[in-house]
């Protein structure tokens, strides 16, 4: 980037620069016409017959340097070819010399500083690349010369530029004084300010653009070179904050549009809101869940929103005495999550009708909650109780939802308790064809024993047709029509209002071989 200190092309009034000495043939200010056909102020000198060593000086006004250390001067000039000038002496030149003089204020006069090299500092002797020439019988032709010189290093508040002619026929068409600065640059979301280089290279600290944050590592910096160019080097720049994405060639951060989000700082663009979420404002780092949808505390900010599952389906119960096997089908709606578990709530109602949460005497296998498989075994059910089990499905966001948790209920009523198995069978009498048996009355929990059933068969005759039954209302029985000297296996069960109890253990008895032995009591 170039910052202009003086551009004669833009001057409309007379320049009124100072010339020395005040003699004929001196630099003269004239109107000229530039490439764009605009009128410009120019200086011309054409004293090609002067005495050797005589110089014509032209000095600009005082130019504040505005902090520049090196200033560039672009000269546009034309010069006549000495060969084309019939009256040109041997002193005719096709060069001129450029000087500068530094001062802290506009202190120069018509005579000071002395018009010589030192105090003036020589910049360069400028030769024309293109000469305007005229050949007899032809039009004069020529081109404009353009030369850029470098002044400095400068240290005072300002300076004058001076031109020394020693026998050229030339015109200074324009003078452009400028310094170079590194233009404000935004790269990798880092803004580097406009910088005037004070040395060959100057380190410049960058700052993050709006809505960007520094990347980890050293703070970003670039080097501004003396020629006004930023030195090419990778920048550990900044990155867009959450809710913003890089735009316009990584020069600014743009807020995520409605319906999109960006959860983290860094590279990457705004993404559409995940399922069941929305963002109603621009610049969202996270999308809000729709009503009824949630993110678990452990879910990433960019995860879809999920909802608690619906109730499990089709609970099937299989009652086996005091044990109950429950199994069910997975819910129709999982809520969009994989972390599905099941839990059971239980209420029990006594035969009399009073109900309460199930007591601690029930055991659940694998447990009453955090079930990952859709089944459970409940043990310790009490007879003649009605149990209500509510099976619920849960997931990682169930705890965030308000309102009732859907469940699938199942009611199970246990049987009233039958008498216990009859044991302690005794043979009170035996004969070759009969056996008299007696047993202790079992303690029936649900009312008195109504009657008994005796099941017996000859040992070794296992088929169903060989088994015989005998009902008795007393706690004794006589088995008749038995084989002589045979072994029999006997079982007894008691019946109450709740039904038959289980058969007791098989009791082994034997009939007599002959009558002579008579009836005799036997203890089982």
């Amino acid at each position: 980037l170039e910052e202009t200190l003086l551009n004669t092309k833009l001057e409309t009034a007379d320049l009124k620069w100072v010339t020395f000495p005040q003699v004929d043939g001196q630099w003269e200010e004239l109107s000229g016409l530039d490439e764009e056909q605009h009128s410009v102020r120019t200086y011309e000198v054409c004293d090609v017959q002067r005495a050797p060593g005589q110089a014509h000086w032209l000095r600009t006004g005082w130019v504040p340097r505005r902090g520049a250390v090196h200033v560039y001067a672009t000269l546009r000039f034309t010069m006549l070819e000495c060969l084309s000038l019939p009256r040109a002496g041997r002193s005719c030149k096709e060069t001129f010399t450029v000087f500068y003089y530094e001062s802290d204020a506009d202190t120069a006069t018509a005579l000071t500083p002395a018009w010589m090299e030192n105090p003036y500092i020589k910049v360069d002797t400028v030769a024309a690349e293109h000469l305007t020439r005229k050949r007899p019988g032809a039009e004069a032709t020529g081109k404009v010369n353009v030369k850029t010189l470098r002044l400095g290093p400068l240290s005072k508040a300002g300076f004058y530029l001076a031109f020394q002619d020693q026998g050229a026929c030339m015109a200074l068409l324009s003078l452009h004084l400028f310094y170079k600065k590194c233009a404000q640059l935004t790269v990798n979301l880092t803004r580097f300010p406009e910088t005037v280089p004070r040395e060959l290279v100057v380190p410049v600290a960058g700052s993050c653009v709006v809505d960007a944050v520094p990347a980890p590592g050293p703070s970003p910096s670039l080097y501004c070179r003396e020629d006004g160019q930023w030195a090419e080097q990778p920048v550990t720049g900044c990155s867009c904050a959450p809710g913003f994405e890089a735009a316009e060639g990584n020069t600014k951060c743009r807020a995520c549009a409605q319906g999109t989000f960006k959860p983290l700082s860094g590279e990457g663009s705004c993404q559409p809101c995940p399922a069941n979420s929305h963002s109603n404002t621009i610049g969202s780092a996270v999308c809000q869940c729709r009503v009824g949808y949630f993110r678990a505390r452990t879910d990433p900010r960019g995860a879809p929103c999920t909802t608690p599952p619906s109730a499990p389906r089709s609970v099937v119960s299989r009652l086996n005495g005091s044990s109950l096997h429950l199994e069910w089908s997975a819910p129709l709606e999982s809520g969009g999550r994989e972390d599905l578990t099941y839990a059971l709530r239980c209420r029990e109602c006594r035969p009399g009708g009073s109900c309460a949460p199930c007591g601690g005497d029930l055991t659940f296998d694998p447990g009453p909650r955090d079930l990952v498989e859709p089944w459970v075994v409940v043990r310790g059910l009490r007879p003649d109780f009605t149990y209500t089990f509510e099976v619920t499905a849960l997931n990682g966001v169930s705890s965030l939802a308000t309102g009732p948790v859907p469940f699938e209920p199942v009611n199970v009523t246990t049987d009233r308790e039958v008498p216990p198995a009859v044991s302690d069978i005794r043979v009170t009498r035996s004969s070759p064809s009969s056996l008299s048996l007696a047993w202790a009355v079992p303690r029936a929990p649900s009312g008195a024993v109504l009657d008994y059933e005796v099941k017996y068969h000859e040992k070794g005759a296992e088929g169903p047709s060989s088994v015989r039954f005998l009902k008795t209302s007393e706690n004794r029985a006589e088995l008749r029509g038995l084989k002589r000297g045979a072994s029999y296996l006997v079982q007894v069960r008691a019946r109450s209002e709740a039904g038959y109890g289980p058969f007791g253990q098989e009791h082994h008895s034997q009939t007599q071989l002959d009558e002579s032995e008579g009836w005799r009591e036997q203890l089982a």
Epitope: E28, L33, E44, L80, L85, K134, E139, C169, M170
Partner: antibody, heavy 126, light 109 residues
């Protein structure tokens, strides 16, 4: 402001020559083009030729080639136009005119003439 | 030789009128065309050079346009002091023979 002052009116015989002068006052002279233009009574303008004093040689319109000589004296900032073998149809007002820009200060070789002398009446009559 | 042809050779107009004079070159002269104004008994005065560049001090009611072979001088609102003869001239060919057009006389209607 530059002024071009021409010499006075002349009455000439056919076959003779006339030399008209044009003195420039104020500033640079050598690098401007000085043109000569004539205007016969009731007629239009007619360009005769021009000179850039620093170069010395002049350029002429084909019509006047061999009959007109244009010169310049840089030391006195004066240009001259001499027309020989005069004929009655050479009776005209003769103007000198200076170009708008010097040969060095224009990007284009414009010969547009923005400064004119007052004119010199040359009458050719026997 | 290059020929410069002006039209019309004369015209009558009133103060305030818009006046247009054309000039045609027999060859392409790019934009190297000048316009002059001359009043009786006076030297010509440069109005426009380079086809469209207004000479310093010339009123802005004068304007020029064109390039190549066809050029126009326009006076947007004729003033009493504008009644004069107008000449076009080419600046392009070397040596520039037949530099001037024959002139257009603008008279009061």
């Amino acid at each position: 402001q530059v002024q071009l002052v021409q010499s006075g009116a002349e009455v000439k015989k056919p076959g003779s020559s006339v030399k008209v002068s044009c003195k420039a006052s104020g500033g640079t002279f050598s690098t401007y083009a000085i043109s000569w233009v004539r205007q016969a009574p009731g007629q239009g303008l007619e360009w005769m030729g021009k000179i850039i004093p620093i170069f010395g040689d002049a350029d002429y319109a084909q019509k006047f080639q061999g009959r007109v000589t244009i010169t310049a004296d840089e030391s006195t900032s004066t240009a001259y136009m001499e027309l020989s073998s005069l004929r009655s149809e050479d009776t005209a007002v003769y103007y000198c005119a200076r170009s708008s820009y010097t040969i060095l200060t224009t990007y284009y070789n414009y010969n547009a003439m923005d400064n004119w002398g007052q004119g010199t009446l040359v009458t050719v009559s026997s | 030789d290059i020929q410069m042809t002006q039209s019309p050779s004369s015209l009558s107009a009133s103060v305030g009128d818009r006046v247009t004079i054309t000039c045609r070159a027999s060859q392409n002269i790019n934009n190297f065309l000048n316009w002059y104004q001359q009043k009786p008994g006076k030297a010509p005065k440069l109005l426009i050079y380079g086809s469209s560049i207004l000479q310093s001090g010339v009123p802005s009611r004068f304007s020029g346009s064109g390039s190549g072979t066809d050029f126009t001088l326009t006076i947007s609102s004729l003033q009493p002091e504008d009644f004069a003869t107008y000449y076009c001239s080419q600046d392009h060919f070397y040596p520039p023979s037949g530099t001037f057009g024959q002139g257009t006389k603008v008279e009061i209607k």
